[in-house]
């Protein structure tokens, strides 16, 4: 028979022939021949292969360094590689994860947008007309300004970003 | 037969170090992530910290961390657990137990080896 | 931290009866890259170490007995024994195996009425 250019799904082509791909958590040990199967082992502890493959060697599982303010959100198998989040109060660099930077707080005048996540960074808006912040927070959103009116007052002293506003009794009508 | 032999327990005053063994025997010591996992007299399980089989990886819980010290030589095939800075309530009975590349589950405890803090 | 919650805390059931406790996880403990729920019963009799039943919520491990069976997923799993026999006296844990910190349920003890 002709010998094949293409394989079948989890097959691959070697010296003419079709060998079957070792499974998710093995690594290759020898390619079939026409007498024998693939012979595949599986990964070692603390090591995985998350596709069917013709790896000799598998991947070490990646490391969450609690030094560099990782800490593991899914534990590793022969399948899967570990998956590192950051401690709270802290978020990923990049999309792999591979270190944690401090939350960026919003400073007076802005307020959190968007709070922070293990992999996002606080977003933060300038407090608009009518709302204030006079703190740094990686928590507090834009406050609206006191309503001197519902409390039977009047503004004594006009809000900002940074400030609320002043309060104070209504001058009496003389008679 | 697969043996996990411990050694190492006592009574200690707190703040008193400690250092655990557990010798293993009957497999490949080397193919095998060790765990420590604690159970104070008449309650529940604590898990207290990993070491992957080439030591690479190593977690703590959080109640131990900074005093308690996972360590391995596979070439003694042995396993270690430093504890320092020991406190009342590190008081408890404590296993190694292995963890395989396919389960990913301690699937083999040790006998336990008893620790005592106390004045 | 993952809490793992076992109900009930004990229970006194006679011989050849079916036996069936709940363990309950504060988050999903499905993996997933291999859609696999890592959640692992122990098995402690008195005065022994735990002994490993059960892992990847309902795999027996080799030498159990097939009247032990796990089922469950995401955060709500069973342990089930159905004919209860003078050597299952003990006190069966479930445990995260999802995660760091591993934890552990409570226990169930199991005694015979």
């Known amino acids: 028979p002709e010998p094949p250019t293409a394989c079948r799904e989890k097959q691959y082509l070697i010296n003419s022939q079709c060998c079957s791909l070792c499974q998710p958590g093995q690594k290759l040990v020898s390619d079939c021949t026409e007498f024998t199967e693939t012979e595949c082992l599986p990964c070692g502890e603390s090591e995985f292969l998350d596709t069917w493959n013709r790896e000799t060697h598998c991947h070490q599982h990646k490391y969450c360094d609690p030094n560099l303010g990782l800490r593991v959100q899914q534990k590793g198998t022969s399948e899967t590689d570990t998956i590192c989040t950051c401690e709270e109060g802290w978020h990923c660099t990049s999309e792999a994860c591979e270190s944690c930077v401090l939350h960026r707080s919003c400073s007076p005048g802005f307020g959190v947008k968007q709070i922070a996540t293990g992999v996002s960074d606080t977003i933060c808006e300038p407090c608009p007309v009518g709302f204030f912040s006079n703190v740094s927070s990686a928590f507090e959103k834009c406050h609206p300004w006191t309503s001197c009116e519902t409390k039977d007052l009047v503004v004594q002293q006009a809000g900002t970003n940074k400030t609320d506003v002043v309060c104070g009794p209504q001058d009496r009508l003389r008679a | 037969e697969v043996q996990l032999v411990k050694s190492g327990g006592g009574l200690v005053k707190p703040g008193g170090s400690l250092r655990l063994s557990c010798a293993a025997s009957g497999f490949t010591f080397s193919d095998y992530g060790m765990h420590w996992v604690r159970q104070a007299p008449g309650k529940g399980l604590e898990w207290v910290a990993y070491i992957s089989s080439g030591n690479r990886i190593i977690y703590y819980a959080d109640t131990v961390k900074g005093r308690f010290t996972i360590s391995r030589d596979n070439a003694k095939n042995s396993l270690y657990l430093q504890m320092n800075s020991l406190r009342a309530e590190d008081t408890a009975l404590y296993y190694c137990?292995?963890?395989?590349?396919?389960?990913?589950?301690?699937?083999?405890w040790g006998q336990g080896t008893l620790v005592t803090v106390s004045s | 931290d993952i809490v793992m919650t076992q109900s009930p805390d004990s229970l006194a059931v006679s011989l050849g009866e079916r036996v069936t406790m709940s363990c309950k996880s504060s988050q999903s403990l499905l993996n997933s890259g291999n859609q696999k729920n890592y959640l692992t019963w122990h098995q402690q009799k008195p005065g022994q170490p735990p002994k490993l039943l059960i892992y990847w919520t309902s795999t027996r491990e080799s030498g159990v007995p097939d009247r032990f069976s796990g089922s469950g997923s995401g955060t709500d799993f069973t342990l089930t024994i159905s004919s209860l026999q003078a050597e299952d006296v003990a006190v069966y844990y479930c445990q995260n195996d999802y995660t760091y910190p591993l934890t552990f349920g409570g226990g169930t003890k199991v005694e015979i009425k």
């Open positions: 137990a292995r963890q395989d590349g396919y389960r990913y589950a301690m699937d083999y």
